[in-house]
């Protein structure tokens, strides 16, 4: 019961986290105009990974996409890549974890298969969360670096725009959403990995016992074999339990490639 709860909670937490990573990636407020020097501006600038926006006090907002790839800074491209990798891994992880959920029955899927799938999705969530946290942190570091470089006509590193003296950028809401979402995905992944341990069937360890029968000696060793007493007609050793000794190579592989346009 505790395993199912841990797995279910891990799934839900990861789902919320990945939704947050997607939201953060799409948000325009990765960096927002610092209003410290001019709190009464009639024009408010903010920028995302995909476009920059200007909100006028009139109520109108104008957004312009970064229609260049080569003209964009490498750091911004790296952040985009990290966030997209995080989303793709998270999405695949969610897909795998749905089939791995203990409460969902799919054919005659063994617990060991579900355990491996749970572990796989858990690892994917952890990597997804780390990608998001890394992406957001790289962007935040870029902002901090650029913050004091607010000299006239400076290159902002954000879509090749020319900066006037007054405008500096600070952390936007998307950064905090990204950090929280990445953390949640990471936590969800860890919970899935913990649940995996509980899902994996436990090995029954039998201590080696030596039976000294007349004429011959047979040692019964642990490793998944249960012996009869050696007396009477049933003298065969029956393999009644696999002991979960399946190799990683035997784990069923799942699709890991999705097309995101």
């Amino acid at each position: 019961m505790a395993v199912t709860a841990c797995q279910g909670l891990g799934f839900v937490v990861s789902l919320i986290g990945i939704a947050g990573i997607i939201a953060a990636t799409c948000m325009d407020q990765w960096s927002t105009q610092d209003l410290y020097n001019n709190p009464v501006t009639a024009v408010f600038n903010y920028q995302g990974l995909w476009r920059s926006c200007v909100r006028e006090s009139s109520g109108f907002t104008e957004c312009r996409g970064y229609f260049t790839l080569l003209g964009l800074p490498a750091m911004l491209q790296a952040v985009r890549a990290l966030m997209i990798v995080g989303i793709v891994l998270g999405a695949i992880g969610l897909l795998v974890s749905i089939f791995a959920l203990k409460c969902i029955r799919i054919g005659s899927m063994e617990d060991s298969a579900k355990a491996n799938m749970t572990l796989t999705s858990g690892i994917m969530f952890i990597v997804s969360g780390l990608c998001a946290i890394a992406g957001v942190s790289v962007f935040a570091n870029m902002l901090v670096t650029n913050f004091w470089m607010s000299t006239a006509n400076m290159y902002t590193g954000m879509g090749g725009m020319v900066q006037t003296v007054q405008t500096r950028y600070t952390f936007g809401a998307a950064l905090f959403v990204g950090w929280v979402a990445g953390g949640l995905t990471l936590i969800g992944g860890v919970m899935m990995c913990i649940a995996c341990r509980g899902l994996a069937p436990e090995e029954t360890n039998y201590k080696a016992v030596s039976y000294h029968a007349s004429g011959h000696s047979v040692a019964y060793k642990p490793g998944g074999f249960k012996a009869s007493t050696g007396f009477g007609s049933n003298t065969k050793n029956k393999k009644i339990y696999d002991g979960g000794a399946r190799t990683e190579d035997e784990v069923q592989s799942y699709p890991s490639k999705h097309d995101y346009v």
Epitope: T41, E56, S57, T167
Partner: antibody
Framework: EVQLVESGGGLVQPGGSLRLSCAAS????????MHWVRQAPGKGLEWVSY????????YYADSVKGRFTISRDNPKNSLYLQMNSLRAEDTAVYYC???????????WGQGTLVTVSS | DIVMTQSPDSLAVSLGERATINCKSS????????????LTWYQQKPGQPPKLLIY???TRESGVPDRFSGSGSGTDFTLTISSLQAEDVAVYYC?????????FGQGTKLEIK
Amino acid sequence: EVQLVESGGGLVQPGGSLRLSCAASGFTLNNFGMHWVRQAPGKGLEWVSYISSGSGTIYYADSVKGRFTISRDNPKNSLYLQMNSLRAEDTAVYYCARAYYGNAFSFWGQGTLVTVSS
Amino acid sequence: DIVMTQSPDSLAVSLGERATINCKSSQSLLNSGNQKNYLTWYQQKPGQPPKLLIYWASTRESGVPDRFSGSGSGTDFTLTISSLQAEDVAVYYCQNVYSYPLTFGQGTKLEIK
């Protein structure tokens, strides 16, 4: 047709109060930031106050801060300017104006005259 | 506060001639986010409210004759009437719409010579 009609102006003694109204028609007021601008007789234009579409942001000129209060009633499509502690230098024609692209004032009312005199 | 200074205070131009009004701001009105200058030009005729002519320093408001044009960037701006008509007699104001308070220039009175 877009129209802004100011009302509430008149003669008032120094230290007195007045409430100006601006009725909008031909557009939905709650989509736009709104301004009050005044013009003393024979003088230039002076911006007075601004209120954002949702009333979340309000700004005043230093000359009226603490004495004037801008407000709006979007369901009634109306803008208001409550003027207290009036002074002789507040004598002017008061215009309400609708904000537009580039923060420009695209539409203006005909104005209402406020005279502060003893 | 941003101070707007217009020159000249008054201008007399012959019909059909070019009229040029200058406006200087004490701070740059260029916004880095969209590379637009937040300066507006208005025309005010006697007994009438002001009328919007130009916004974003160079974008003509719909319905405004194309003889009116705006130019300039940063702190220096110009309103040009390419061929003066009798109906263009008015006072012209530039306005900072970049930072509050939204200050106006003192106005330039345009007359026919």
